[in-house]
Structures are given as structure tokens and as C-alpha cells.
């Protein structure tokens, strides 16, 4: 699978996460940081 | 199966506003982003400006700045657009389309027609 | 604003000839482009995004290139179906689409 890094304009799309560009399957992807899920790592779990 | 259903269309008065809606299934809005994207009859293609239902914020071409807003419901999964101080140039078939989660996913269009 | 300068506005090729139409930006988009096509009284139809990324059921006969401020949409044989007019848009930083090239047989 191709990926970089999101474009600009994706900024501020994964709230708690980096946003990665997944090309081949045309979308963005969060990967959210320990602690964080959601599409956009946006509910904090414990 | 995700779908972007959008309003039917509308003649308006010019000076008037408009609102057009943008109803997702399938998927949830927060998730993604939503473009309006227009194109008058016989001209290309215009991006008008996105939305972030998450967190509420747009942002619009320089353009259309103070006379377009674009609003989000969360709770129906519904994206709206409205255009305000219509002419005729404003005349043209209004796209919603989704971005994000996945690239680039088109509603069907909404004509709207400004007429006096 | 990022403005995406598309040439030509229009053409007209015969069966078989190979197509291509250019797009400039006013800066470095980072590959961030995407290519429609659009036939009348249809929305447009994405063909490539991130410069060449042909979408599932596009024809191989369609492809992109480019880097920087320059890219390039090329039709490698012109077939009937591909009459229509053809944007491209740059997603880097919002959006902006080219002016359309219309795309005819001769």
C-alpha cells in the first residue's frame, strides 16, 4: 500500500493522531495516539 | 451503501437567498469533510468552499466571503449550504462532495435558478 | 489562492491519437492533483488522484504525471467515449479547479 504524508488542507483532521495518505485506497487514515480512537481520534478511552 | 442526497431544485427571486441541503447515509458526516463545488450552465467547475462537521469550522473561497455559509447538523448527518444577495450569474447546478474518509464523492447536483 | 492555469480549453483529435492537456499551478502542489471527466448533464467522474492514481474501472488508456507546479493528463488512444470535457483540481491547499478542456473528435 502507497502512502505519504496528508496534504495541507488536512490539517487539524485527526484531532489526536497523525494523519496519513493512503493512496491507493484514495483516503486519509489517523493514526491516533495512545489513549485516543475514532475514525478522526477523537474519544479519549482510558 | 454511502449516498449524498441532496435538496430538489429551486428558482429564486434575485436579491434572495437560497439554502441547499445535503443529506448522508452510509456514513457519518463527522468523519469526513464537505466540499460545495458549483458549475453555472456551460462553464467549468467552481469550488465554493468545505466544512469540517466536527469541529464546525469552513472555509470559503475569497469570492464568495459574506455571502455564502456553510452549516452542518450533526444530529441528521445533513450538510447545508446558503448563498445570499442572488444574481443571475449564480445561476448554476450546486454539488456537494464528500472528502476524507474517502476521496471525492459527489451528490447529484441541485439546480438552482435565479430569475426575476 | 492556489490558481490552476489547464491548456488547452478545448481540442480536437482523431481515433487513436494520443491526448494530452497540461496543468499549471501558482505553487507546489506536492502531487496533490486529481483529473474529472465530465460529459453533459452528468456530475464529473473522477478518473486519477495523487497525479496517477488511475481509480478502479478507469481505463489503463488514461494516466497522469507531473511534480512541483507542473502536471499532465495524457488519453495514450483516443476512443468515441472519450468525448467530454476534461478539469483538473489541485487538493493541496484547499481546492482549485482548471478551466476544462473539451475534448473532440475530429
Known amino acids: 500500500v502507497s502512502i505519504t504524508k496528508c496534504n495541507s488542507d488536512m490539517n487539524g483532521y485527526c484531532l489526536h493522531g497523525q494523519c496519513i495518505y493512503l493512496v491507493d485506497m484514495s483516503q486519509n487514515y489517523c493514526r491516533c495516539e495512545v489513549g485516543y480512537t475514532g475514525v478522526r481520534c477523537e474519544h479519549f478511552y482510558l | 451503501q454511502d449516498q449524498l442526497v441532496q435538496s430538489g431544485a429551486e428558482v429564486k427571486k434575485p436579491g434572495a437567498s437560497v439554502k441547499v441541503s445535503c443529506k448522508a447515509s452510509g456514513f457519518n458526516i463527522k468523519d469526513t469533510y464537505i466540499q460545495w463545488v458549483r458549475q453555472a450552465p456551460g462553464q467549468g467547475l467552481e469550488w465554493m468552499g468545505r466544512?469540517?462537521?466536527?469541529?464546525?469550522?469552513?472555509k470559503y473561497r475569497e469570492k464568495f466571503e459574506g455571502r455564502v455559509t456553510i452549516t452542518a447538523d450533526t444530529s441528521t448527518n445533513t450538510a447545508y449550504m446558503e448563498l445570499s444577495s442572488l444574481r443571475s450569474e449564480d445561476t448554476a447546478v450546486y454539488y456537494c462532495?464528500?472528502?476524507?474518509?474517502?476521496?471525492?464523492?459527489w451528490g447529484q447536483g441541485t439546480l438552482v435558478t435565479v430569475s426575476s | 489562492d492556489i490558481q490552476m492555469t489547464q491548456s488547452p480549453s478545448s481540442l480536437s483529435a482523431s481515433v487513436g491519437d494520443r491526448v494530452t492537456i497540461t496543468c499549471k499551478a501558482s505553487?507546489?502542489?506536492?502531487?496533490?492533483i486529481a483529473w474529472y471527466q465530465q460529459k453533459p448533464g452528468q456530475a464529473p467522474r473522477l478518473l486519477i488522484q495523487?497525479?496517477?492514481t488511475l481509480q478502479p474501472g478507469v481505463p489503463s488508456r488514461f494516466s497522469g504525471s507531473g511534480s512541483g507546479t507542473d502536471y499532465t493528463f495524457t488519453i495514450s488512444s483516443l476512443q468515441p467515449e472519450d468525448i467530454a470535457t476534461y478539469y483538473c483540481l489541485q487538493y493541496d491547499n484547499l481546492r482549485t479547479f482548471g478551466g476544462g478542456t473539451k475534448v473532440e473528435i475530429k
Open positions: 466544512i469540517d462537521p466536527l469541529r464546525g469550522n469552513t
Open positions: 495523487y497525479t496517477s
Open positions: 462532495v464528500r472528502s476524507g474518509t474517502l476521496f471525492d464523492f
Open positions: 505553487q507546489d502542489i506536492h502531487k496533490y
